[in-house]
């Protein structure tokens, strides 16, 4: 069978191959469609209320006005000459429709690099058969899950036209250190070849690079965190954040429970104080930030002191806040 | 809202004529196919007559065929039905039918005028 | 020319009765089958439409099904206002083709 491929809404003329050019023609059309149960068959005595789909023109070819997609099938001629040979004719219809240009919805102005972000939505309305949408950084194709790229599709048929709108959800996690301005454009492939893609118009979202959270850092006094008995520790907690943050105080995982304050004093040191110390910043802006751990022990006259980190007992004994 | 509205029916003897006219409303006249179908007394429904929505081809029931001769003014949203060589047997109730053509078959019709043909 | 046989002529039902009218086809006319309603004095009215979709405003208790050559109209549960002749129509070829009518009376 030769292949057509028609536009919906276009008219099409199939030829009847070896018909006469004039009646009296000895022909007939069957048609296997989306119109028909089986075959259809037509003769250029006149199709009566098929006339306004298909007819059978004076010189025998197969004229449809106005293609559908109930058009789609398969087409067939029988013709006999003035000499009695017959010509058989054999057409595949396929039918399309080219949606119009594709539009990038709900984009976002800004995307945050590190987490994921959704660019925007794709929208394709009016094809025929579906097609594909696909999206494009900088130019380059991008594929769904892959680095940080993920896609949500969806597909609705409108119950009277039968021409389909495609929507695409594009999600992106920017790597940092990236492009401050990347440009993504969605691409619409018809699903029938030979037709090329319809680009949308490009968009250039800013991305934002959240500044790192500076380290909260520990500070202990004397150094190391070895004292003898009856000595002060001094703990601070130095957060470079501004406003300054809440301090809060951990002894072996367990909260302190005194007020915030970014010191600590552990006066006359006892073996009750012995431990792993932390402290806690809380941010209005952001989740609690925890220090480094660090140990404090007590060390007999004559002993080498340890080196800081390591762990000492357990017990509280008398605390001073700065 | 789509309205067919018939007009022209009435009392004629054999061999007379009568044209009948149907105005239509409530939707775009020039993209549907139009029919006449009719009924008489007591009897079933009978198509009579169909044309395309150009105008440019018509269709009729071989008992009205070189009597009856259907028309259409799509200026007008007018369609029309020229009766002539009228017989008894053509007394009934003529309907104005949208469609005709197999995208909808016959839809919606109008309320019917009598034609009745006696001497 | 297609004749449509259209059976029963004429039935007596009961309110809440199962109603079915079929309509056979001398050669296959596909799925180009409507089903009209019409009262005494009035105009039919179109119920279904090619073989099996419900007409706009036509309650669903109408259905119709078939192709080719049988074709059926169910009514799942009469009601008062269903009292009528029920007509089948062919639209794949001409002449147009009517079946003879079903009048659905009160038993």
């Known amino acids: 069978a030769q292949n057509i491929t028609a536009r919906i809404g276009e008219p099409l003329v199939l030829k009847c191959k070896g018909a006469p050019k004039k009646p009296p023609q000895r022909l007939e059309w069957k048609l296997n469609t989306g119109r028909t149960e089986a075959w259809k068959v037509l003769s250029p005595q006149g199709g009566g209320p098929w006339d306004s789909v298909a007819r059978v023109l004076p010189n025998g070819s197969l004229f449809l006005p106005a293609v559908g997609i109930q058009d789609e099938g398969i087409f067939r001629c029988q013709a006999m000459n003035r000499n009695g040979k017959e010509t058989k004719s054999n057409y595949r219809v396929r039918v399309y429709q080219i949606p119009g240009k594709p539009e990038i919805v709900d984009s976002a102005s800004e995307l945050t690099a590190g987490v994921p972000n959704k660019v925007g939505t794709c929208v394709s309305e009016g094809s025929y058969p579906a097609g594909t949408l696909s999206w494009h950084l900088d130019g380059k194709p991008l594929v769904p899950n892959e680095k940080g790229v993920s896609v949500k599709e969806q597909t609705r048929r409108h119950p009277e036209t039968g021409l389909f709108t495609l929507q695409s959800e594009l999600m992106v996690t920017p790597a940092r250190g990236g492009d401050p301005r990347p440009t993504f454009s969605c691409s619409f492939s018809p699903g029938l070849p030979r037709h090329r893609a319809l680009r949308t118009a490009p968009i250039q979202p800013r991305v934002w690079e959240p500044v790192p959270l500076e380290e909260v850092q520990l500070v202990v006094e004397p150094e190391g965190g070895a004292v003898a008995p009856g000595g002060t520790v001094t703990l601070t907690c130095e957060v470079p954040a501004q406003p300054s943050p809440q301090i809060h105080w951990m002894k072996d995982g367990v909260p302190l429970p005194l007020p915030p304050s970014p010191v600590l004093i552990l006066p006359e040191i006892g073996p009750q104080d012995q431990g792993t110390y932390s402290c806690v910043a809380t941010h209005s802006s952001h989740g609690p930030q925890e220090s480094r751990a660090v140990s404090i022990s007590i060390i007999e006259p004559g002993e080498e002191g340890p080196t800081a980190g390591s762990v000492g007992g357990s017990g509280l004994g008398t605390l001073a806040l700065a | 809202e789509v309205q067919l509205v018939e007009s022209g029916g009435g009392l004629v003897q054999p061999g007379g004529s009568l044209r009948l006219s149907c105005a239509a409303s409530g939707f775009t006249f020039s993209n549907y196919w139009m029919s006449w179908v009719r009924q008489a007394p007591g009897k079933g429904l009978e198509w009579v007559a169909s044309?395309?929505?150009?105008?440019?081809?018509?269709y009729y029931v071989d008992s009205v065929k070189d009597r009856f001769t259907i028309s259409r003014d799509n200026a007008k949203n007018s369609l029309y039905l020229q009766m002539n060589s009228l017989r008894a047997e053509d007394t009934a109730v003529y309907y104005c039918?949208?469609?005709?053509?197999?995208?909808?078959?016959?839809?919606?019709w109008g309320q019917g005028t009598l034609v009745t043909v006696s001497s | 020319d297609i004749q449509m046989t259209q059976s029963p002529s004429s039935l007596s039902a009961s309110v809440g009765d199962r109603v079915t009218i079929t309509c056979r086809a001398s050669q296959s006319v596909g799925s180009y089958v409507n089903w009209y309603q019409q009262k005494p004095g009035k105009a039919p009215k179109l119920l279904i439409y090619?073989?099996?979709s419900l007409a706009d405003g036509v309650p669903s208790r109408f259905s119709g099904s078939g192709s080719g050559t049988d074709f059926t109209l169910t009514i799942s549960s009469l009601q008062p206002e269903d009292f009528a002749t029920y007509y089948c129509?062919?639209?794949?070829?001409?002449?147009?083709?009517f079946g003879g009518g079903t009048k659905v009376e009160i038993k």
């Open positions: 090619r073989a099996s």
């Open positions: 129509l062919e639209f794949d070829e001409h002449p147009l083709t």
């Open positions: 039918a949208r469609g005709g053509d197999i995208t909808t078959g016959l839809d919606y």
């Open positions: 044309i395309k929505n150009d105008g440019d081809n018509t």
